[in-house]
């Protein structure tokens, strides 16, 4: 039975040219995290494997940095980075947990962070 929940940074916004940290946290489960996939729509951005460490997709390596923790830092943001991001936690023995973050990249200098929310 999957008892865990994923807490994410929720709906967030950031300035064009700036950077943002995408963060998810798995709680309420003792399952072992074996891998975290970070995806943007149908693009794999990065994998953090418990044994092998980080793999950043070559197409993103200039603008994506691993961490902090199991999170992902997006740099040199453009308006095209606006959209949904998913953290996919592979765990044993529970299975897969998925969290969703919506990022809006703003032209203006005012970019407010949204509130945290949970996905069961």
């Amino acid at each position: 039975m999957m008892t865990g929940t994923i807490e994410t940074t929720g709906n967030i916004s950031a300035e064009k040219g700036g950077s943002i940290i995408l963060q998810c946290h798995l709680s309420s489960t003792t399952a072992q995290v074996t891998q975290v996939n970070w995806e943007q729509q149908d693009q794999l951005l990065a994998i953090c494997n418990a044994d092998l460490g980080w793999h950043i997709s070559p197409s993103f390596k200039d603008r994506v940095a691993p961490g902090p923790g199991l999170g992902l830092t997006l740099q040199s943001l453009t308006v095209n980075d606006t959209g949904e991001y998913f953290c996919i936690y592979h765990t044993y023995p529970d299975g897969t947990y998925t969290g969703r973050i919506f990022l809006e990249v703003l032209e203006s200098s005012v970019a407010e962070h949204g509130a945290r929310f949970q996905i069961p």
């Epitope: 693009q43 070559p58 197409s59 592979h90």
Partner: antibody, heavy 122, light 107 residues
């Protein structure tokens, strides 16, 4: 020497689930620190990567097939498996298992099975 | 996804001749491109990785070049066993994609 061998039904009915297994010999799935993948090739056509798995059970998939694909691993048997649901004639192909060099890019897909033809037909 | 277009579709040459195969990507794949050889009834065999590096055990007559969107596989002098289908593959962006193949046949 590392060898991979695909096995499973050669004929699957439309709307059913295609199931294949790849048995690895000459090396341990769980000690090699590699991913293990499935690739298919429709008759007379090019190659399509389906997805890959690590010995821990962690996966990553081709987005175009993600909703229908499950790849799993059985380290005790040194095997990994592919399930593709709701198949149609378009899924008729030779299915290959291979070692995926995700964290070892010089490898790309260095080791392959010989492939098995799966036909989807009623 | 990145589309890889190979040309020509078929190349008719004689043993001893030079073969030049092209692979063009729909967007830059940097140097993250591989070449495979496939003979009838066999699995593909990795020849070249990262555009220009020969895989283990591949003869020196096979060479790769290019970066960005345009890549070339060259077989300096065709041996009888080189007549096969050749595929390029990128792993710059997810998902991995392959080209449609070039068949090198005996003239």
């Amino acid at each position: 020497q590392l060898q991979l061998q695909e096995s499973g039904p050669g004929l699957v009915k439309p709307s059913e689930t295609l199931s294949l297994t790849c048995t690895v010999s000459g090396g341990s799935i769980s000690s090699s620190r590699y991913y293990w993948g499935w690739i298919r090739q429709p008759p007379g056509k090019g190659l399509e990567w389906i997805g890959s798995i690590y010995y821990s059970g962690s996966t990553y998939y081709n987005p175009s097939l993600k909703s229908r694909v499950t790849i799993s691993v059985d380290t005790s048997k040194n095997q990994f498996s592919l399930k593709l649901s709701s198949v149609t004639a378009a899924d008729t192909a030779v299915y290959y298992c291979a070692r995926d060099g995700l964290y070892h890019t010089p490898e790309y897909f260095q080791h392959w099975g010989q492939g098995t033809l799966v036909t989807v037909s009623s | 996804e990145i589309v890889l277009t190979q040309s020509p579709a078929t190349l008719s040459l004689s043993p001893g001749e030079r073969a030049t195969l092209s692979c063009r990507a729909s967007q830059s794949v940097s140097s993250y491109l591989a070449w495979y050889q496939q003979k009838p009834g066999q699995a593909p065999r990795l020849l070249i990785y990262d555009a220009s590096n020969r895989a283990t055990g591949i003869p020196a007559r096979f060479s790769g070049s290019g970066s960005g969107t345009d890549f070339t596989l060259t077989i300096s002098s065709l041996e009888p066993e080189d007549f096969a289908v050749y595929y390029c593959q990128q792993r710059f962006a997810h998902p991995y994609t392959f080209g449609g193949g070039t068949k090198v046949e005996i003239k």
